[in-house]
């Protein structure tokens, strides 16, 4: 049977890395769906056996670790009672290049690099992208500039998956990397993410990325209704800031993991001349009393803006 093609993700990453990809297509994946991963052109699904190097773990496909032979196109097929959708991932696995001799001390010389920006004269933070299923335990984050490990001090302070950089100067740009230990079923793996950091003078009164909506505003919404709110973000092309919705300092998808009543949507983007306009929505399938007065915050790099739902004011006219 034919499935509707939703989109294709292009992913380039180094061999030897643990690699996850989560297949989500809200609101379809909020309800009862059958979700299966395939490697094309095979008609056999990826195994659910968690002891295999490549396996499906709930909505995720997990490579522990990647090999060069894993390059190819993977399809995630989402079926519910009425529809079928497929999301493709074009995976390119590169030779490992962590600080090898040909790189002149730089870990960042390939396409599998996150671009991030630090604001000159201010404090900024770098994100270590660590999104894995619950079956994976993550710890022992280390940060590197070039190939030298960064030690916590006045300049740098690690905090969870972030590296805070104080009083950013031009020379703080360059090649960074973060590594973390991943434990899965008693086996250990090392994750390494490479980050190319640019420093930028921040325009007075304006942050990069710039959240154009929401604006720390309230929205009147009736109890029990469905609501979709877009977060609109303008960012420079070379930046790879994380964009997400949070509540109570927790990712919305994690906070409402069990009920899936509130979900973050698929991110879309439009390329402008020297910027990209991103949109990521939040969907309230059914507004409850507990949602009123609670800030739902859109985050993009160092920028954040929230909405607060308020009960509609009665119209006495």
């Amino acid at each position: 049977d034919t499935c509707e093609d939703i989109f294709m993700h292009n992913v380039i990453i180094s061999e030897g890395q643990p690699f996850p990809f989560n297949c989500t297509y809200p609101p379809e994946t909020n309800g009862a769906v059958n979700l299966t991963w395939y490697k094309t052109p095979s008609k056999s699904p990826v195994s659910n056996n968690r002891h295999l190097r490549v396996h499906q773990d709930q909505t995720w496909i997990l490579f522990l670790p990647l090999t060069l032979e894993d390059s190819g196109i993977y399809q995630c097929v989402i079926r519910n009672a009425h529809n079928c959708y497929q999301i493709a991932v074009n995976l390119t696995v590169l030779k490992n290049h962590w600080c090898d001799s040909s790189m002149e001390g730089s870990p960042v010389n390939s396409p599998d690099v996150y671009q991030q920006i630090l604001p000159i004269g201010k404090s900024g933070s770098l994100n270590c992208h660590l999104y894995f299923p619950e079956s994976c335990a993550l710890d022992s984050i280390k940060w590197y500039k070039g190939c030298e490990e960064i030690k916590a001090g006045k300049k740098y302070s690690p905090s969870g998956a972030k590296l805070l950089v104080n009083n950013v100067a031009v020379e703080d740009g360059g090649s960074y990397a973060c590594s973390a230990r991943l434990t899965h079923l008693g086996r250990h793996f090392t994750i390494r993410n490479y980050i190319a950091v640019n420093t930028k003078e921040v325009e007075y009164g304006r942050r990069i990325p710039n959240i154009t909506y929401p604006k720390n505003n309230s929205i009147e919404v009736p109890l029990g209704s469905t609501l979709i709110v877009n977060c609109n973000i303008t960012d420079t092309k070379e930046n790879t800031n994380l964009r997400c919705w949070r509540v109570n300092n927790t990712l919305v998808d994690d906070y409402y993991k069990d009920s899936k009543r509130i979900q973050e949507g698929i991110e879309t983007n439009v390329s402008l001349r020297d910027q990209i306009r991103y949109t990521v929505n939040i969907t309230f399938l059914k507004v409850k009393m507990e949602d009123y007065g609670r800030p739902f915050t859109c985050h993009a790099g160092v920028s954040a803006a929230y909405i607060i739902l308020i009960y509609p004011v009665p119209d006495f006219r």
Epitope: S140, I141, R181, H188, D254
Partner: antibody, heavy 120, light 111 residues
Framework: EVQLQQSGPELVKPGASVKMSCKAS????????MHWVKQSHGKSLEWIGF????????RYNQKFKGKATLTVNKSSSTAYMDLRSLTSEDSAVYYC?????????????WGQGTTLTVSS | DIVLTQSPASLAVSLGQRATISCKAS??????????MNWYQQKPGQPPKLLIY???NLESGIPARFSGSGSGTDFTLNIHPVEEEDAATYSC?????????FGGGAKLEIK
């Protein structure tokens, strides 16, 4: 100042259940896993498991699966441990302790402990 | 599960002298250049207190007379010079894999 404030001592009968709490303050609750550790009288420490308040994930020591259930209430920054089908073997001091998600793999702050006595 | 064996189970050390406590793991707790071994101090009626993490790193606020060393399966906690307030039970703990396990403890008495 970081504090983990645990609920008071419990005296329960065999076969009963108990729910103890650990209220966190002085830090961002969702940045740390909350672990639970058992210490029987005169014995060494035993790790029970942890709850990740950031993503709702739990991990248990196989020995305590079916015995302990870990939960949290994020809005009150409180972690809970339910112990069921209690026997005299469960009499012990139970500690909650935190570990920074992603970054560390050690327990830097501990609660004062909740003493559980199971006796008929 | 990784078993941690501490020795001696108890020791008495004179004020100002060195106390040495050993912890042996049933398998290596090293990964990627790091040792996943921590040390705690516990006094009667109190919770454990972190002293040393990752085998040799001194926790903030802990006096420099405490030091940790070792790798693989063999680890040591040293206290020098021993002070009156150091009378306590000292436990090692591995965070290499779950279930995280603790040693049986070593009780330090000051002579």
């Amino acid at each position: 100042e970081v504090q983990l404030q645990q609920s008071g001592p419990e005296l329960v009968k065999p076969g009963a259940s108990v729910k103890m709490s650990c209220k966190a303050s002085g830090y961002t609750f969702t940045d740390y896993n909350m672990h639970w550790v058992k210490q029987s009288h005169g014995k060494s420490l035993e790790w029970i498991g942890f709850f990740n308040p950031n993503n709702g994930g739990t991990r248990y020591n196989q020995k305590f699966k079916g015995k302990a259930t870990l939960t949290v209430n994020k809005s009150s920054s409180t972690a809970y441990m339910d112990l069921r089908s209690l026997t005299s073997e469960d009499s012990a001091v139970y500690y909650c302790t935190r570990q920074e998600i992603y970054y560390s793999n050690y327990f830097d702050y501990w609660g004062q402990g909740t003493t559980l006595t199971v006796s008929s | 599960d990784i078993v941690l064996t501490q020795s001696p189970a108890s020791l008495a050390v004179s004020l100002g002298q060195r106390a040495t406590i050993s912890c042996k793991a049933s398998q290596s707790v090293d990964y990627d250049g790091d040792s996943y071994m921590n040390w705690y101090q516990q006094k009667p009626g109190q919770p454990p207190k972190l002293l040393i993490y990752a085998a040799s790193n001194l926790e903030s606020g802990i006096p420099a007379r405490f030091s940790g060393s070792g790798s693989g399966t063999d680890f040591t906690l040293n206290i020098h010079p021993v002070e009156e307030e150091d009378a306590a039970t000292y436990s090692c703990q591995q965070s290499y894999e779950d279930p995280y396990t603790f040693g049986g403890g070593a009780k330090l008495e000051i002579k």
